[in-house]
C-alpha cells in the first residue's frame, strides 16, 4: 500500500548514550519527508520531528520521562509538499522501530577520571559522576543517581615503569588503592552494569598518570615505620 512516490523508512536504529537518545533510519529522502511518533507500550503516540528531511530524530526529551519504560517509535513517510497525501489504505507509509528500554540499553559513555590524590602509600582515584538528561524535581540526575548500585566502575592501574596491571572495582565513584612508595602509576576506568546482558561496559576512560596535572601528592603522611 502507499503512494507510488514515497518509500517506507527502514533500518530504524536507536543510538543512545547516557540516555541521550536518537532514532536513526534510512533512506535519505528523495521527494519525501518524515514524521516520527513515540509511545510507551501502554501510552499514546506522540509526534516528533514533524515533516523532516533528516534521517534522525532526537527523542531524549520523551524517554527521560521514565527511563525504565519500554518505548516504541515509528517513522511515517509523506510526499514532499503534499503531506496530507496518504497511502491507498488511507494512511501514510510507516515503519516500526525495535523496542527500546533506556535503563537496560543506553550505552555507557566513556568515563573520565576526575582526580587522583596520593597520601603516602594510598591513592584515591575519583571518577567524574557524569550528568545525564534525566530530570527529577527540575534537576538533572547524574549517572550514579539513575543507576545507583547497579553501576560499578572497574579501575586498571599500573606502574609507569612496568606493564604489569592490577584492577579494582567500586560501587561508588571512588577507589582507594595501595601503591608502592616513590612509584608513579597510570590509571584508566571503565563503567559497568553487571546486571545487563547487552551494552554492559563502557569504553575505557583516557589514561591519566601520576606526575600530571590531575593528581595531587600530600607529604603530610607518615608510614608506620616512619613513626
Amino acid at each position: 500500500s502507499g503512494t507510488t512516490n514515497t518509500v517506507a523508512a527502514y533500518n530504524l536504529t536507536w543510538k543512545s548514550t547516557n540516555f541521550k537518545t536518537i532514532l536513526e533510519w534510512e533512506p535519505k529522502p528523495v521527494n519525501q519527508v518524515y514524521t516520527v511518533q513515540i509511545s510507551t507500550k501502554s501510552g499514546d503516540w506522540k509526534s516528533k520531528c514533524f515533516y523532516t528531511t533528516d534521517t534522525e530524530c532526537d527523542l531524549t526529551d520523551e524517554i527521560v520521562k521514565d527511563v525504565k519504560q519500554t518505548y516504541l517509535a515509528r517513522v511515517f513517510s509523506y510526499p514532499a509538499g503534499n503531506v496530507e497525501s496518504t497511502g491507498s489504505a488511507g494512511e501514510p507509509l510507516y515503519e516500526n522501530s525495535p523496542e527500546f528500554t533506556p535503563y537496560l540499553e543506553t550505552n555507557l559513555g566513556q568515563p573520565t577520571i576526575q582526580s587522583f590524590e596520593q597520601v603516602g602509600t594510598k591513592v584515591n582515584v575519583t571518577v567524574e559522576d557524569e550528568r545525564t538528561l534525566v530530570r527529577r524535581n527540575n534537576t538533572f540526575l547524574s549517572l550514579r543517581d539513575v543507576f545507583g548500585k547497579d553501576l560499578i566502575y572497574t579501575l586498571y592501574y599500573w606502574k609507569s615503569s612496568s606493564s604489569g596491571k592490577k584492577t579494582a572495582k567500586t560501587n561508588t565513584n571512588e577507589f582507594l588503592i595501595d601503591v608502592d612508595k616513590g612509584e608513579n602509576y597510570c590509571f584508566s576506568v571503565q563503567a559497568v552494569i553487571p546486571s545487563r546482558t547487552v551494552n554492559r561496559k563502557s569504553t575505557d576512560s583516557p589514561v591519566e598518570c601520576m606526575g600530571q596535572e590531575k593528581g595531587e601528592f600530600r607529604e603530610d603522611y607518615k608510614d608506620d615505620d616512619d613513626k
Epitope: 560499578i152 572497574t154 586498571y156 572495582k169 588503592i177 571503565q190 546486571s195 546482558t197 547487552v198 561496559k201
Partner: antibody, heavy 117, light 107 residues
Framework: QVQLLESGAVLARPGTSVKISCKAS????????MHWVKQRPGQGLEWIGG????????MYDPKFQGRVTITADTSTSTVFMELSSLRSEDTAVYYC??????????WGQGTLVTVSS | DIQMTQSPSSLSASVGDRVTITCKAS??????LSWYQQKPGKAPKLLIY???SLADGVPSRFSGSGSGTDYTLTISSLQPEDFATYYC?????????FGGGTKVEIK
C-alpha cells in the same frame, strides 16, 4: 545458552610450556572479563589471572607473574592461558571462568595439566 | 593483597540442620564477594553473587549476608545434595583471592 569449553588434558615435561584454551559461546566475551583458576589435587581454588577482551588488559597474581600469559581472540571467542617453566607443582586442573562484574558466574569443565618427566 | 579467612575449614552436619560459613576479608571489599559450591571432579558452581544475591537456579535455602569485611553463607535446612565444599571469593581488587574452603560432611 552460555558455555565455556576448555581444551583437553595435557601431559607436559618440566621446564616446558603449555597453552590451554577456553572457547566461549552464548555471549560476547568483550562484554565480560575472563579468568583462569588453578586447583591442585585435593586443594582449594587459586586465582591465576584475568583478561578484559574488550581492551586486552591482563592482570595476574604475583605468584604467576612472568610465567603466565592470558590472551583473548575476540574473533573466535576464545581465551588462552600459557604457562611456562612448568614444574611439578603446576600439576592441577585449570578452570576458565566468566566474570560478570558481580561474580565468576560461569565456569569451564576444567583442563587437567600433568607435569611429569 | 587482600586475605580471605574462611571458617570453619570443615563441619559435620545432618540433613535439616542450619549451616553457617563465614569469610572475613583483611580490608573492605565493598560487597564484591561471591560464594561457590564444588563437588568432587566438578567445576565450582555460583551460589551467591554481590554478597547477598541468589544466583539463577539456586534453591532459596541458600542465602548470603554481610558487608565491609565480614560475610556469611547460610544454608537454612541442609539437604543431601548440599554435602560439598564451599568457597568464598573476593573480586574487588586483584589479585582476586578465594577463602580456603569449607567441607560440609554428613554427621
Amino acid at each position: 545458552q552460555v558455555q565455556l569449553l576448555e581444551s583437553g588434558a595435557v601431559l607436559a615435561r618440566p621446564g616446558t610450556s603449555v597453552k590451554i584454551s577456553c572457547k566461549a559461546s552464548g555471549f560476547n566475551i568483550k562484554d565480560y572479563y575472563m579468568h583462569w583458576v588453578k586447583q591442585r589435587p585435593g586443594q582449594g581454588l587459586e586465582w591465576i589471572g584475568g583478561n578484559d577482551p574488550a581492551n586486552g588488559h591482563s592482570m595476574y597474581d604475583p605468584k604467576f607473574q612472568g610465567r603466565v600469559t592470558i590472551t583473548a581472540d575476540t574473533s573466535t571467542s576464545t581465551v588462552f592461558m600459557e604457562l611456562s617453566s612448568l614444574r611439578s607443582e603446576d600439576t592441577a586442573v585449570y578452570y576458565c571462568a566468566r566474570d560478570s562484574g558481580y561474580a565468576m558466574d560461569y565456569w569451564g569443565q576444567g583442563t587437567l595439566v600433568t607435569v611429569s618427566s | 593483597d587482600i586475605q580471605m579467612t574462611q571458617s570453619p575449614s570443615s563441619l559435620s552436619a545432618s540433613v535439616g540442620d542450619r549451616v553457617t560459613i563465614t569469610c572475613k576479608a583483611s580490608q573492605d571489599i565493598k560487597s564484591f564477594l561471591s560464594w561457590y559450591q564444588q563437588k568432587p571432579g566438578k567445576a565450582p558452581k555460583l551460589l551467591i553473587y554481590y554478597a547477598t544475591s541468589l544466583a539463577d537456579g539456586v534453591p532459596s535455602r541458600f542465602s548470603g549476608s554481610g558487608s565491609g569485611t565480614d560475610y556469611t553463607l547460610t544454608i537454612s535446612s541442609l539437604q543431601p545434595e548440599d554435602f560439598a565444599t564451599y568457597y568464598c571469593l573476593q573480586h574487588g581488587e586483584s589479585p582476586y583471592t578465594f577463602g580456603g574452603g569449607t567441607k560440609v560432611e554428613i554427621k
